[in-house]
């Protein structure tokens, strides 16, 4: 296995996932494509935790670019051994991967809490509240209850879809960073095994 190529593949995947996380989080601010609910502060409290923008997004770009950089051939050797610098780089990528695990973990936790609590909406009794908070997430299994939210239109579908996407993306990011921890440790211990002749596709 070529540890550097694997890291680069993980890095590129994380960039894509991070951008999707940022997009999903931004969409949470505009239920049904409307801006007024953000300005009126009629959005779920978990939208304001920036889990997709920060946790699954910006914080994920740091490890992503570190992983991508591992494939470069300009790693400095040490004590006359070229592979020593690459080993150090692989081991340092473990630290970057741990930052990624923290970011994606934050994204997953906040998305799960957002799903469990449900949206802030104008209920059928004309009150703005966390209508489904008392259901402990069971509203997710009973779509006939979603009409209890009268405003914003389709807010339950909107929240459930986007928080589910954040949960899934964060979960994938978490797994990829976990893989890179293992990859980085193995790459650091076993050495940078790729010769210039070897070509591996991820």
């Amino acid at each position: 296995m070529c540890y550097g190529k694997c890291a680069r593949c993980i890095g590129h995947s994380l960039v894509g996932l991070a951008l999707l996380c940022i997009a999903a989080n931004i969409l949470l601010y505009f239920p049904n494509g409307e801006t007024k609910y953000a300005s009126e502060n009629h959005l779920s409290r978990f939208v304001w935790f920036f889990s997709g923008i920060v946790g699954g997004g910006l914080l994920m770009l740091l490890p992503a670019f570190v992983f991508i950089g591992l494939e470069q051939d300009d790693c400095c050797g040490c004590c006359g051994h070229e592979n020593c610098g690459k080993r150090c780089a692989m081991l340092s990528s473990v630290l970057a991967a741990l930052i990624g695990i923290a970011g994606s973990g934050y994204c997953v936790i906040v998305a799960a809490l957002g799903l469990a609590e449900g949206p802030l909406c104008l209920d059928s009794l004309g009150q703005w509240n966390y209508t489904f908070a008392s259901t402990e997430g069971q509203y997710l299994l009973d779509t006939s209850t979603w009409s209890e939210c009268t405003e914003p239109k389709h807010i339950v579908e909107w929240n459930v879809s986007l928080f589910s996407i954040l949960l899934a993306l964060g979960g994938i990011e978490f797994i990829l960073c976990l893989i890179q921890v293992i990859n980085g440790v193995l790459g650091g211990i076993c050495g940078f095994c790729c010769s210039h002749q070897q070509q591996y596709d991820c």
């Epitope: 059928s124 009794l125 004309g126 009150q127 006939s144 979603w146 009409s147 209890e148 009268t150 405003e151």
Partner: antibody, heavy 116, light 107 residues
Framework: EVQVQQSGPELVKPGASVKMSCKAS????????MHWVKQKPGQGLEWIGY????????NYNEKFKGKASLTSDKSSNTVYMELSSLTSEDSAVYYC?????????WGQGTLVTVSA | DIQMTQSPASLSASVGETVTITCRTS??????LAWYHQKQGRSPRLLVS???TLAAGVPSRFSGSGSGTQFSLKINSLQPEDFGIYYC?????????FGGGTKLEIK
């Protein structure tokens, strides 16, 4: 003071349609959800549907789909319910109720009598 | 649709007494239950929403309790204006459904 005023009684022939109104006053109309409820003489309450005048979000009881049609006019703070293809089964008092920050405010009801 | 079963269908009580009306639902509605009072020839009036939240202007002698599928409305120290029909109603999604009513009469 919050008030919900409904239109007067209606005597209509079978097969005809009727449109009743419900005018709200004393509060921000668009911050309320307006519900319609049917009550046959001497019987219980039956929910027809709701309309949120702020975004025209409408939800009907499956039983009244095709029978009732809810609309709103923000300029006059009025919601309307039209009942079509009337039969004797539709003879009842129809209540309009506004639900919002000041609680629930029910109209006095509109009596609809379907008779040949 | 969620079925609402009220009991008793009717009861007689004297002014000053305490009465309890119960409501059972066909599925778990958590705390999404409301109570109404209707006098003869009048519109229903909301008393309680979300099981125990008293509506504006409702006297403290009224209290709601319960959760899941079993709910009750308790009226302490009955007053002459409390007589009439009481309805329970779920507001856990749509369609809203009402109980058959409990007729409270003066003994």
């Amino acid at each position: 003071e919050v008030q919900v005023q409904q239109s007067g009684p209606e005597l209509v022939k079978p097969g005809a349609s009727v449109k009743m109104s419900c005018k709200a006053s004393g509060y921000t109309f668009t911050s309320y959800v307006m519900h319609w409820v049917k009550q046959k003489p001497g019987q219980g309450l039956e929910w027809i549907g709701y309309i949120n005048p702020n975004n025209d979000n409408i939800n009907y009881n499956e039983k009244f789909k095709g029978k009732a049609s809810l609309t709103s006019d923000k300029s006059s703070n009025t919601v309307y319910m039209e009942l079509s293809s009337l039969t004797s089964e539709d003879s009842a008092v129809y209540y309009c109720a506004g639900y919002g920050n000041s609680g629930a405010n029910w109209g006095q009801g509109t009596l609809v009598t379907v008779s040949a | 649709d969620i079925q609402m079963t009220q009991s008793p269908a009717s009861l007689s009580a004297s002014v000053g007494e305490t009465v309890t009306i119960t409501c059972r639902t066909s599925k778990n509605i958590f705390n999404f239950l409301a109570w109404y009072h209707q006098k003869q020839g009048r519109s229903p009036r909301l008393l309680v929403s979300h099981t125990k939240t008293l509506a504006a202007g409702v006297p403290s002698r009224f209290s709601g309790s319960g959760s899941g599928t079993q709910f009750s409305l308790k009226i302490n120290s009955l007053q002459p204006e409390d007589f009439g029909i009481y309805y329970c109603q779920h507001h856990y999604g749509t369609p809203w459904t009402f109980g058959g009513g409990t007729k409270l009469e003066i003994k």
